[in-house]
Amino acid sequence: KSSSEATNITPKHNMKAFLDELKAENIKKFLHNFTQIPHLAGTEQNFQLAKQIQSQWKEFGLDSVELTHYDVLLSYPNKTHPNYISIINEDGNEIFNTSLFEPPPAGYENVSDIVPPFSAFSPQGMPEGDLVYVNYARTEDFFKLERDMKINCSGKIVIARYGKVFRGNKVKNAQLAGATGVILYSDPADYFAPGVKSYPDGWNLPGGGVQRGNILNLNGAGDPLTPGYPANEYAYRRGIAEAVGLPSIPVHPIGYYDAQKLLEKMGGSASPDSSWRGSLKVPYNVGPGFTGNFSTQKVKMHIHSTSEVTRIYNVIGTLRGAVEPDRYVILGGHRDSWVFGGIDPQSGAAVVHEIVRSFGTLKKEGWRPRRTILFASWDAEEFGLLGSTEWAEENSRLLQERGVAYINADSSIEGNYTLRVDCTPLMYSLVYNLTKELESPDEGFEGKSLYESWTKKSPSPEFSGMPRISKLGSGNDFEVFFQRLGIASGRARYTKNWETNKFSSYPLYHSVYETYELVEKFYDPMFKYHLTVAQVRGGMVFELANSVVLPFDCRDYAVVLRKYADKIYNISMKHPQEMKTYSVSFDSLFSAVKNFTEIASKFSERLRDFDKSNPILLRMMNDQLMFLERAFIDPLGLPDRPFYRHVIYAPSSHNKYAGESFPGIYDALFDIESKVDPSQAWGEVKRQISIATFTVQAAAETLSEVA
């Protein structure tokens, strides 16, 4: 049952009214409108779309809609000097060249400004040398190569398949291994689901399709030239040599037709096991270099992309709260795309548009939310979450004092199997309660709740009868709000069946084939999954903005803290002798978690029983709930990652997309057995345990009775 109150209006303006106003047909129309031409960050087309969205949000009834601009570092291919990779013979002649563009899909042949596939922020360069195949280029793949197989990547060009981890981590790993260049490719094992046709006849990746994407390692910094501060007119900008997170070696992506030509000649060591072999008809030899007959041939990269400071535009819409206008609930998703953005981001942007329209309709009828709702259309997400991060940097003082929650709204779908939610534990109960009230769109679940189909298809690994909710990682616009500012955050989308579809992301991700037709023909012809995602995202925003008492349950944080403490203890216990030698103990952390659990339980009792008609008391209790996430922020940040400040969660150091719990301790323990100074290494483990202990205890104390 919704806990929201009606403000300034009759009780009919409740959650049901808001949800009923959301229409699949509108989302479909908006998606079509947003996907007819490319909207690459920093281009005129994307500026025009920003102005269109501004205009429409005003028409929908928001109180104000502003464009906020920033001048940030972006990266583009050189239009007259294209990027490509060649195989050269001993005379230096190019005997094979990779394609210069993706063949455009039918109906889009005459569209201008389709950016060719490139790795954004790659430096220029023309390295040549032998090739080494490095599987997914994960940390463990390089361990296997260097430690077990004794293969040295120094001075080599490495070729890695996309998937499993964020591409920026692959490039960082290759740099650390001494590679002089990186070739990224999409293997059919990861991007071609068996039994499905290639686009345009199905949703699989054709051989000429290529995944674009940035290869930064920003660690939450935002614009590489202005870390920590907004990239405005008076900002001090670093020189390019001091910029944050830029790769130091050339990188370029290719499709599997071109990859076949490079990989089929590979010689050297055989692949270590089947987990290193994809689905191409090639041996998947590791190298280095080509096999006997081709051993004199080399690979050469030709990369001429440029990085330039470019203006970007966010659209920020405001629906002022009637009772607590200084409390902000934010719904944000990006607008910029690599090409047409059929799924990423416009399936999300279309949902945001319809959510704004529904809220606007209620507002025109005299309703207002209790708290202020901010709507955001972020720019330059694809270039490193730049629009959202710059705006949050500019408004950080307001956000840290007033930010209640952030709900992310990138791609609404990455499949059509079941719901996928990642969020702070504070929102678990909100999500469970909301999905119990929504109807499932899934076949075979007619008349059943979304909660029921979600639980059936994606069960929690720990608790029977409940669905899985994952940790927040990064790779999307919630990052600055959650990882840097400590604002409770969540995201929801429809996803694939991870059990049967092992490929990474969806096959056409960041390719030219990510079109409106892809969605309308193959993923969601009735737009029923989009509608469900709109209901989940919109419903969360409605409850967060309108509930008298914030719909956060601190007891769920207690449960996960115990789970994460158990996990990190178990990892540490791999080294029982060192724990004894260096007197490493987790007792303090377990004690702090126990204290948190007891205090959270008592807080929940007080929350249930207090006089909700007392506005001072109500505000006080809500502030304790709002500021709980903030209490997990360490102002000093994580080691070498100052903008990742959340002590309980951070993006994994080995995969930006994944979340890691107690990341400070985890990173201190990682590969500790190979550290040259074990005493120092275990000292750092102890330091991180003490930071985690202090933070959990301090957070617990924010929930104690105020006086």
Epitope: N570, M573, K574, P576, Q577, M579, K580, E673
Partner: antibody, heavy 118, light 111 residues
Framework: EVQLVQSGAEVKKPGESLKISCKAS????????IGWVRQMPGKGLELMGI????????RYSPSFQGQVTISADKSINTAYLQWSSLKASDTAMYYC???????????WGQGILVTVSS | QSALTQPPSASGSPGQSVTISCTGT?????????VSWYQQHPGKAPKLMIY???KRPSGVPDRFSGSKSGNTASLTVSGLQAEDEADYYC??????????FGTGTKVTVLG
Amino acid sequence: EVQLVQSGAEVKKPGESLKISCKASGYSFTTYWIGWVRQMPGKGLELMGIIYPYDSDTRYSPSFQGQVTISADKSINTAYLQWSSLKASDTAMYYCARITGGYLFDYWGQGILVTVSS
Amino acid sequence: QSALTQPPSASGSPGQSVTISCTGTSSDVGGYNYVSWYQQHPGKAPKLMIYEVTKRPSGVPDRFSGSKSGNTASLTVSGLQAEDEADYYCTSYAGSNKYVFGTGTKVTVLG
């Protein structure tokens, strides 16, 4: 009381697959490494590899890498050693052992005699 | 990693002492104080006798003792008894979760 109980003796033909087990009890299975040790007839002890059941982190001795697979199921406190294609030279006694602080093998299973013969 | 070198056999009369050597390198025996010794009777599983070079688990008679000098560790059985007749193996930690076993020594109690 800490115990490691191994499955029974096996007689197999060359080329067949085999999975032998080691069930632990009396301690927290997930937080101790388990090692598998081979002893060929009349020969000494050879460490094949070790596994940490909590996250199935597995390390193989170089001469056994790619020859066998070590795994664990923490839900039933059991470690496994398996072959996809046995050879006559795999005939041996196989022990599982718990590894504890001080890098010592403090508890051992009773051993499994595997005989591979055509 | 090569196996640690032990003498194939050693013997002594009841009541006498016998010492078994275990020679490795600076990467294993010489580099760590994590040498352990195991006793194995025919048809039985090995049993821990000494750990961390010199320490004895409870239940192991005090006539078993260990020591180390440089890259060589030693196990001494003083006051030899008939039940001490068995195979003895040393093992050493070699860093990064690597372990090296000795070649084994057959101890015979004469008489």
